[in-house]
Structure formats: C-alpha cells, structure tokens
C-alpha cells in the first residue's frame, strides 16, 4: 500500500521543513517545575513503542507508523541505561531504586542501595535510599501512585517502599525469620512510610486480614485478604487522614474524584493486579486513564504543586505471556493516559516524563507491507515450509514442546487476543531485555534529558526541575503562576 | 559481581549530579556547520548499541554496561522512524534514501522518491531524488563515502546513486531490457553521477572487466571483474581527476593519505564486502578506523568544508547471519573510528551524526550477571531441559531442523565467534526489525536532533546546519574560525 | 561422571540437633539447579524438605520444616542441611538431590522453579532415639 | 498440597499392562510439572518421567506419562521383572513460594 501522497518528494520536504521549524522554536525553560509527572510503562522498550505506535494508528484506520503516539509529541529524548548492580538485564524493583530514588540496587530489591542483599532482611537498615516522590512530599507538595498492576508490585513500590525483596506483598509473603528481624511487607509500608496523596490501582487482597471476602468476588475464597497479622491497612489509611477516602470500583472513583471534601483517596479495583485493558469490565473498573485524570483532579488543588507516579504496568505482563496483542494494548492505554495527562496540565509548570523500566526480548521484523496488520503473518515461509508472524520473541512460553516441531500459523490464529507469538527458547515466563530504552520529556527543564544517561539521572532531573533534595539550590526562576 | 563503590549511594548520586552539571552547561550553536559527518551503524538498532557497548567495556575488562561508546557521549539524542513508504520494516536502500536525500522511497529502491517502483526501470527517471553529499558538492565542498561494505551497496549508494533495484551492482547484475531502457549500474553511478573526492570500502570487482583477475585473489576467477561492458570504471575514474590515485591495499592507503599531491582517492580493498574484522588481515586491508582517518586527512584540506559519510556496513551482516559475535565486533570497530574521528576534527564546525538505518530481531535477555559474558549462557535452564544464550534472535539461521529438536549449547560454543544465536523461526537470513533506531548528534545545530522523527529528518537536519539546498537562506552565523 | 554424596547421618538424641553435608563431583552448583533435600523414614514414602539455588541464596521448605531446617551452600560443590529439635518421627534416610531450575514468571515476579530431581545422592540415614 | 496416589500395591504378570494414577488437590505449576520415579530397595528414587509425559534419558519406551493439571497417569506396557519396584509421583507448586509434594507411592510386584 503506497499513499499516493507519500510519494511525491515534496510530502516529505515539506514535513522535514516543519519538524526542522520547530525544532528551531524548541526554547529551554529555564523555570522550575512545579509539577512532575513520571509515567513508567513498564517492559516499554523501544520495539514496543513502534509496535504499539502502528497498533494504534491502524486502530484510526491508517497505515500505522506515520502516526504519532502521545509520548511521540515530546519534545526532548535521551536514552536510559538499565542495569542494576548485579545483573545486565534488570527487574522493576532494582529499575524502580533507580528511576526514582536516584540510585541502583540489586535485582529484586526496592529503594536500598546495593550494599543491601536480595532477601537478606539484616541488610535492609542504614541502606535505604529516599524517592523523589518522598522528597516532594517533604516539600510540602501533593504526591500520588497510579498503576494497573497492584498498588504494592515492585514500580510503584519504588516511591516508598524499601525491602530486600520485591514479593512481600503481605505479611503472609514475608518469612518468619525476617518478620521477627523487623522487615516489614510492602502493603505496611505504603501505608505508613509516607503521607501518600492519592493510591490507585489493585492490590486489595494485600490489605486485609485472612478470611476477609472480597467485595467483588465474596466467593472467591483465593481472592480475600491475604494478611497474617489481623489488620485491616485500609481502615488504619483511612484513620490517619479526615478527608481519606477509600473507593473499589469506577462509580465510587469518578464520584470520589470531584467531591471537594476528599483529601487523600486510596481506589483498590482488583485483588491482585487489575484486569488487561481487553478483559476490563468498564462498569466496575476505570481504565489507567480514567485513574490518571481523578489523581490529577485530586492533586492539582494543591498550590504548591503535585508528584505523579503512573505507571502502565502490564504491557510486562503482557510480554512476559509471550502476548503481544495483550502487552500493544496495555501501551495504548498508557498512551491514551499520557495523552489525557497532558491535557490536563500545562507543560508551563509541569515535567513530564515517559520512560520505561526495562525492555523485551521481543522484535518485529519479517518485512511485512506498510498497513498490514502488526499481528500478521511476515510475506513467505520459513525454512520449516510454515508461516510465522512478524512479532516473535527470543524466549518465552510461545513453544510446543510436544514433538519440538515449530507449530504452523494462520492469520486469524495470530491475531487472536490469546495468541503467544513463538520464541527461539521455551520458558515459563519470557524475560526482559537489557538493552537501553526511550525517555520522553517535556516541560520545565525537559532539555537536561539529553544523551545516554545512567536510568538514576532521571531521579535526578525530576529533583532538580522541582529544587527539591538535594538540589535546593537548584538557582531557577520559580515556575510562572506560582501561588506559593 | 557487585562493585563495592556502587553499593555507596554516593557513588550514584555523585555520577547523576555530574551529569546534570553537563546537560545544564549545553548551549546550542547557533553557527552553521563546516564539516558533515554521517556515521552509518548498518543494522545497529538499540539492542545492538548496548550489547556492543559491555562488549567493549569487558574487552577494556570493565564488568560491562558502565562504560561509555564514543556514541554514548554525544549530548543529543532522538528516534527515528525507519518504515519505508511500502513496508513496516526496511531495507538499507529505502533508509538510506531517507537519511541521505530526505525523502522516504520504497524497499529496495534507492536514491528514488516512491514514485519509482521496485525492478522497473522506466520508473526511474523524473523520480530522482538528490543527496545531501550531491549538495554538499555543489557547494564546494569535498565529499567522501567510507564503508567495510562494498561501496556500491545499498548505504553508500543513497548518496551518489538512483536505482530501482539495490542490487544492480555492476552491469552484469541488470537486466538487458533494464539496461536497454538506460538504467545504470550503481558502479557507474558511482563514477559519473557526481564527483566524490574519496572512496573508500570493498566492490573491486564491479569496477573491472568480466576475466579482470583481481589483484589480491588472481587464481580466484569468481573475485575478478564482472563487467559485461568492458569498461575499466576505475581507469575512467582516474582519467577524471588529475591528482586522482587508486590503492587496494593498505600500505597503499596509508601512503595516499598523506601524499599532498593526492586531491582524490578511490581505495577498493576486496572484491566484494571487506571482511569482516575479526577476519581481517591487517597487513592488507586497513580498518574502518583507518579509512575514516585518511578520508579526514585528505578531505579536512578543503577550506569550505566536507561532508563524509562513514558506514559500519557489516553489523548489518553479521545479524543476517545470526552471529552476534560478528555484529558486535563489527560495531565496535564502527565506535572506535566515530572515536578516532572526534579526534581528528573540532565538534565548534562539525556536525556529526550516528544513526542506524535499521535494526534486527536480535535481543538480550535471560538476567545474566553483571561482568557476564554477552555471549553467554542465561542462569537457569529452559523447559526443554537445556541452556540458552543471552542473546538471541526472533527468527534466523540459527536452527536445526533435523528433529526439531532445539540444540543444546555451552559456554564455550556460546563464546565462537562463528556460533550463531538460535532463533524462533528458521530462515535461511535472520531479518531487519522495524522499531525506531536512535540518532546521535554533536556539532553545530546538533541541538535541532530531538525528540522522535521520521528518518528523513536526519538529511534535512544536515543540509540546514551547513546551509545546502534547500536551506541556503539559513540564517545562521558562519561557523568560527571559516576560512571561506 | 555427577555424583551427589551425602555425609554427616547418625545417631542424634531427641532434641539434639545434626549438620548434614552433600558433596558433588563431576559437577559445581551453577544456576542451572537447585539443590535439595528429600528424606524418606523407614519403610515410608519420599518427604520433600527444602531447596536452595545457588544463584541468589533463595531457599524454600516443605511447611513443615520452617524454621526447625536451614538450608545452605556453603561452598561450589557442598551444601548442608542443619536440622534441630529432632525427634523420633526424624528418622529417616535423608537424600541430597538436585533438581533442574526453570525460569518462570509467577504471580508478578521472577523466580526460578524447582522441577523434577534428576540427580539423586545414596542418602545417610539420621537415627532419632534415645 | 496433598498428591493422593493409587493404588497403594499393584501386582502385574509379565508384558501385562500397569496404572498408576495420581491426584493432586490443587493444579501443579504450568500444569505439567509433575514427574515419576521409580526406587528399587536400598536405592534412590530414579526419575522416570518430567513435564508429566516427558521420557527422561535412559528410560525405556514402555514408561508413558500422560495427564494435566491435578490428574495424571503413569502406565507401564509389556510389564518386566526389572520393573518391580515402587513408584512415587511428584509435584511442584507456586503460592508466594515454590514447594513440592510426593504421593505415597505405588509397589509394583512382577509375577
């Protein structure tokens, strides 16, 4: 499919010319944030995004790549470096330490520096590194977590959270031994390591006592509180705070959003992590979107500014399924977030940054004709003498183990939601990628994200951009419409 | 391995305030640039970069992913989109149409707007697009195209070249209908399109006579010459220029670059591709590193300046093949000459830009231990009960489809240079990838590279900063320190 | 050749405590596999206990043996069992194995599981009694 | 996790067919980790079958492991004497940790 448009010289002098033009334009803010916004799409390496771009222009019936996602739109890019201390291909709780606190840690920990050891609890006190989003809040700032995984998994986990190991979720996750040591599980640290704003996503099961039905599945005995010490975290959020309000399920959240006499609100939409955007029962849980926009409805009353943790957090799980359909449409939700984000704030007073934590080991190749659908079939045969899509993955659990034949594909299989696109190397669970990936800024002081940086200096331009520790001193012009 | 100094949240934070001391001190050059640099990494997508980056930190015996590629230091960075106006995922001749003419073309195609169709010949003129090294000549400056390829592929070609079909090497390589129809050979393009001051890479045979033996391979009929014309196109070449020299060797070149009577110089030093590096002889065929320091000796003499385009053509190769140690040495020797350049010219008149034109299905996953080989084996086993790579590729020729059966491997065969990756899908040449590939930029009006564009903009970016059609009305101060 | 050789079994009073050790030849722990510990009491059925993978120290124990048992690596090719509080329903012969390390992502997080256990030791029988 | 294993004894002339069954309480991990071993007195168990119907290596044709999820299948065809011997299954499982559970085992007596 060739555009007719496309193939004149003067479309694409005519668009450079542009792009050029503005690029000119392009001034450094040299204002203070009095926002920030970092959005994480978690496992977004770059072969996703271009995936996710053509998903979603094919989605407004054009071809695909010439299409712009949200994140597209920002003006300033660099590239992150991902590994953690101990590992070249990271987790999210290691990227996580880095992104926001500003330092590496070791795989599978969260906010401790790497003199601590994954599961270790002994190694846990004096190695505790702060976020920024603590930093904020000390700032007298409004400061809030959205994500579609749980409330306590490894990213948001990152902005107040610290422990050895990223699966203590509950109590119930955390071994007796480093109970007594006094390691404490995520869910008790959201609530009371730091005065959180606004928290949403799931994570029910987590702050409840064992026994405890859950309000959406009372009869899923699996589904309800998971907590080994009798409390019920949620009761304890609610009674620190006059205006909290705690809500678990999109009528609650969008009500709870616009009344005036709420101050803090916790949304808990799911057990565990929320549904895949696909499988969301619009009545009973808002979209990433949806949530972003009640945390900024919330947050921007405060004069002096708000920080912003939202986090797309399955287009992971998606890939780690081997499910590209699943992991594309998670990153086009996240898109439509940033999107939304960004028309609810001004890039005058607020940064925002998209990043992602780590990549996939997931490639689109196979030279397939501009428009074909990004789930299809690449034109030919493989030696094998059978099809094969354009999306594959260099491990992962699309494998038939059965007769070690590669199974034969159509292109109605390929394009079904459930499919899992073939790998080299049958795992359980594909694994991330360590190469570099994409940081998107825009804003005050988006210009610093320039070049090839360590994952941690994005930590650091948050900080900076908002003159918060350790850069007080930070020397900017107050943002323009301060009222602090 | 964890380095006790990184286990000191100092050690992080340090690092980032020291790189945001740099990105604050960044001031665009708001002068025009004397000198244009293109640096080609053929096929090196993001994945690549990284992997090829610890690669380079182990063989300086560094744990890896810490250290720094002379790409990683150039302070700005965008995304290119690579799709070509007809395909989702590229080839080389339809990119270098983008990043060397600024007008996307279709697969195959180079030099071409996408009115030209693929293999038809009469579709080729009216439809010719110009390069900015044709305009960069036009300007008075001094020209050179550099590449471990043959100089007559699909890269290189983008800048001399208008051809349906990138595989026109030599006239033996066209159709007699196509030849009738008055389509030219990319080898004579290559002398009679325009006058290029320095040519340097592999293609000797395309130049030759067919029963030309070649210099370096005379008992190997196969190495000769392939022309059916009889033209001896570097005969015709040297009659062109009078202080014009040709060299096949080494020594040869090392002599020309510093011959002061040599005002152009053409430098083929195998029949085809050059080796690959690790397979170069080093007493016969120079380095890429070695032919981008005597193309900057001889073309930095021009007091307007020159633009030079230098392409690691072999990454490229390397990933077809499925042998990541290929493609990763090959990508560092394509750093080493980016490094041995910013040595050799002065970033307040040069503008230099690194890009890809593509990437691969190729990933590294498996969380590997830092200071691990890249080309090692990943911690645990797969289900079916054996080893796997770090890296690998979605689909390639790294298979046996005797019985299916994926092959078990070791650390030691992991580590051969010849060892290919295994891939998901059997096929006889791994493929490109379509996500975006990164840009990296340094110089005058290295600034205007951000964000993510389309691959177009990286020729539009270059004619604007040295002021060539259709940028001559400019507006920008003359470089410091011009001598025109 | 691998081998997997148990030491350290005996006679032990009730309440005393006892060290076992697994040796490997032909092989070193790698991340490859964990390393276990399976007890079978007289004319019984086979009894998992624990595991550990080398890789990162992990450990995990049958719900019974929490806190009574420590595994541990205390080299590249030994590993150890430490047993205390030992009682009559102890006596067992206990088998060192090794069982294959498979990636897997479970429940949002990464983890390696314990498969099958393809190498086993002879076992060393550990007498409970007073 | 209980894995409940039957019979408890099962006698078999000689190139005669064998069923062991075994149910798990809950599903294994991925559905199919789950293995066989057979112990001969005064031995260690020796694998028979992984992945629930995988050979391992060593292990004669006439072992076949079939099943899925909470219910599986040991079968022996064409009965051997060297195949007296008790059988025991094996599980893995994933609930915030990896365990493992044993049935009770199954003694094959050859006549």
């Known amino acids: 499919i060739i555009p007719v448009e496309e193939e004149n010289p003067d479309f694409w002098n005519r668009q450079a010319a542009e792009a050029l033009g503005a690029a000119k334009k392009l001034q450094p803010a040299q204002t203070a944030a009095k926002n920030l916004i970092i959005f994480l799409g978690d496992g977004m390496g770059v072969s996703t995004v271009t995936a996710a771009r053509i998903l979603k222009g094919q989605k407004k019936d054009k071809l695909g790549p010439e299409t712009f996602l949200a994140m597209d739109r920002f003006p300033y890019v660099a590239l992150s470096k991902t590994y953690s201390v101990d590992k070249h291909v990271p987790d999210s709780g290691a990227t996580a330490t880095a992104y926001l606190c500003g330092v590496k840690g070791n795989f599978q920990t969260i906010g401790l520096s790497a003199a601590a050891r994954f599961n270790q609890c002994n190694t846990t006190r004096g190695n505790e590194v702060i976020s920024v989003m603590n930093r904020a809040k000390k700032a007298g700032k409004s400061v809030g977590v959205v994500t579609t995984t749980r409330v306590q998994h490894a990213s948001p986990a990152g902005a107040y959270a610290h422990t050895v190991n990223r699966n203590w979720y509950s109590d119930a996750d955390v071994p007796a031994s480093a109970r007594q040591e006094g390691c404490q599980d995520i869910a008790t640290q959201l609530i009371s390591n730091m005065d959180i704003d606004v928290i949403l996503g799931g994570g029910r099961k987590y702050m409840f006592p064992m026994g405890t039905p859950d309000p959406e599945y009372p009869d899923d005995y699996s589904q309800g509180g998971t907590r080994l010490d009798g409390k019920n975290l949620v009761q304890e959020w609610l009674a620190k705070h006059q205006g909290a309000r705690y809500v678990w399920n999109r009528t609650e959240l969008l009500q709870a959003s616009l009344d005036p006499s709420v101050t803090h609100l916790m949304g808990l939409f799911e057990p565990g992590d929320m549904k895949y955007e696909i499988h969301r029962d619009s009545t009973l849980d808002p979209s990433l979107m949806e949530m972003t926009e009640a945390a900024l409805l919330l947050l921007s009353r405060n004069p002096r500014g708000f920080f912003l943790f939202v986090e797309g957090g399955r287009i992971d799980h998606g890939h780690h399924e081997s499910r590209a359909y699943r992991a594309l449409t998670e990153t086009i939700m996240f898109d439509d977030a940033i999107e939304r984000a960004g028309q609810l704030t001004s890039e005058e007073d607020t940064l925002s940054l998209v990043t992602a934590d780590h990549s996939h080991v997931f490639s689109f190749g196979g030279y397939p004709l501009r428009g074909s659908s990004i789930f299809g079939l690449a034109p030919g045969k493989a030696r094998d003498r059978k099809a094969y899509t354009v999306l594959l993955y260099g491990n992962g659990p699309g494998y038939v183990l059965k007769d070690g034949a590669r199974p034969d594909v159509t292109e109605s299989e390929s394009g079904s939601p459930e499919y899992r696109q073939q790998s080299a190397v049958p795992l359980d669970g594909e694994t991330h990628a360590g190469e570099d990936v994409a940081v998107f800024a825009r804003g005050p002081q988006a210009h610093l994200v320039h070049g090839v940086q360590e994952q941690t200096f994005i930590a650091h331009v948050m900080a900076f951009a908002a003159c918060l520790e350790p850069y007080t001193a930070c020397d900017l012009a107050p943002r323009a419409g301060t009222t602090d | 391995i964890i380095p006790v100094e990184e286990e000191n949240p100092d050690f992080w934070n340090r690092q980032a305030a020291e790189a945001l001391g740099a990105a604050k001190k960044l001031q665009p050059a708001q002068t025009a640039a004397k000198n244009l640099i293109i640096f080609l990494g053929d096929g090196m997508g993001v994945s690549t970069v990284t992997a090829a980056r610890i690669l380079k930190g182990q063989k300086k015996d560094k744990l890896g992913p810490e250290t720094f590629l002379a790409m990683d230091r150039f302070p700005y960075v965008a995304l290119s989109k690579t799709y070509s106006v007809d395909k989702h995922v590229p080839d080389s001749g339809a990119t270098a149409t983008a990043y060397l003419c600024g007008v996307k073309g279709n697969f195959q195609t180079i030099g071409l707007s996408a009115a030209a169709r693929f293999n038809q010949c009469n579709t080729t003129r009216g439809n010719e697009v110009i390069s900015v090294m044709n305009r960069a000549k036009k300007a008075g400056k001094s020209v050179g195209v550099v590449t471990t390829t043959r100089v007559q592929h699909a890269s290189p070609a983008g800048a001399y070249a208008h051809t349906v079909n990138r595989n026109w090497y030599s006239d033996a390589d066209v159709p007699a209908s196509a030849r009738q129809e008055g389509c030219q050979d990319i080898a004579t393009q290559l002398i009679s399109n325009m006058d290029i001051d320095v040519i340097l890479g592999g293609g000797r045979k395309y130049m030759f006579p067919m029963g030309t033996p070649d210099p370096e391979y005379p008992d190997d009929y196969s190495q000769g010459g392939t022309r059916l014309d009889g033209k001896n196109l570097v005969q015709e070449w040297l009659a062109k220029h009078q202080g014009a020299r040709y060299v096949w060797n080494r020594t040869e070149l090392l002599q020309a670059s510093l011959d002061p009577s040599v005002t152009h110089l053409m430098g083929l030093f195998e029949p085809g591709d050059m080796k690959y590096e690790i397979h170069r002889d080093s007493t016969l065929d120079p380095s890429l590193m070695e032919m981008t320091e005597a193309a900057l000796l001889l073309l930095s003499r021009n007091p307007r300046g020159f633009f030079l385009f230098v392409e690691g053509g072999r990454i490229d190769h390397g990933h077809h093949e499925s042998r990541a140690y290929r493609a990763l040495t090959e990508t560092i020797m394509f750093d080493d000459a980016i490094e041995r350049a910013g040595q050799l010219t002065s970033e307040e008149d040069t503008l230099s830009l690194v890009t890809a034109d593509h990437s691969h299905v190729f990933s590294f996953g498996g969380y590997p231990l830092r200071g691990s080989s890249i080309f090692g084996l990943a911690p645990g086993k797969a289900r079916d009960r054996k080893a796997y790579t770090v890296l690998l590729y979605g689909n390639g020729p790294g298979y046996v489809l005797k019985d299916g059966a994926r092959p078990d491997v070791t650390e030691s065969e992991s580590g051969s240079p010849e060892y290919r990756q295994q891939s998901a899908v059997p096929l006889d040449g791994e493929t490109h990838a379509g996500e975006d590939v990164a840009v990296f930029a340094r110089g005058p009006q290295a600034h205007l590279v951000h964000g993510v564009q389309e691959q177009t903009f990286i020729a539009h970016v270059m004619a604007f900063a040295a002021c060539l059609e259709p940028y001559t009305a400019c507006d920008l101060a003359p470089r410091a320190g011009t001598t025109d | 050749q691998e081998h997997l050789e148990e030491s350290g079994g005996g006679l032990v009073k009730p309440e005393g405590s006892l060290t076992l050790t697994c040796t490997a030849s032909?092989?070193?722990?790698?991340?490859?596999?964990?390393m276990c510990w399976v007890r079978q009491a007289p004319g019984k059925g086979l009894e998992w206990i624990a595991c550990?993978?080398?890789?990162?120290?992990?450990t995990y124990y049958a719900s019974w043996a929490k806190g009574r048992f420590t595994i541990s690596k205390t080299s590249s090719t030994t590993v150890t069992l430490q047993m205390t509080s030992l009682t009559a329903a102890d006596t067992a012969t206990y088998f060192c194995?090794?069982?294959?390390?498979?990636?897997?992502?479970?429940?949002?997080?990464?983890?390696?599981?314990?498969?099958?256990?393809?190498?086993w030791g002879p076992g060393t029988l550990v007498t409970v009694s007073s | 996790q209980v894995l409940t294993q039957t019979p408890s004894s099962v006698s078999a002339a000689v190139g005669g067919t064998v069923t062991i069954n075994c149910q798990s309480s809950?599903?294994?991990?991925?559905?199919?980790?789950f293995s066989w071993y057979q112990q001969k007195p005064g031995q260690p168990p020796k694998l028979l079958i992984y992945?629930?119907?995988r050979l391992a290596s060593g292990v004669p044709s006439r072992f076949k492991g079939s099943g899925s999820g909470t219910q599986f299948t040991l079968t022996i065809s064409g009965v051997q004497c060297d195949d007296a011997a008790t059988y025991y299954c094996?599980?893995?499982?994933?609930?915030?940790?990896?365990?493992?559970?044993f049935g009770g085992g199954t003694e094959v007596v050859v006549k």
């Open positions: 194995a090794r069982a294959l390390a498979y990636y897997a992502y479970v429940d949002g997080g990464h983890s390696y599981a314990i498969n099958d256990f393809d190498l």
């Open positions: 032909g092989f070193s722990f790698s991340s490859s596999y964990y």
């Open positions: 550990i993978y080398p890789d990162d120290g992990n």
């Open positions: 809950q599903s294994v991990f991925s559905n199919d980790y």
């Open positions: 992945d629930a119907s």
């Open positions: 094996q599980g893995t499982y994933y609930s915030s940790a990896w365990y493992n559970a």
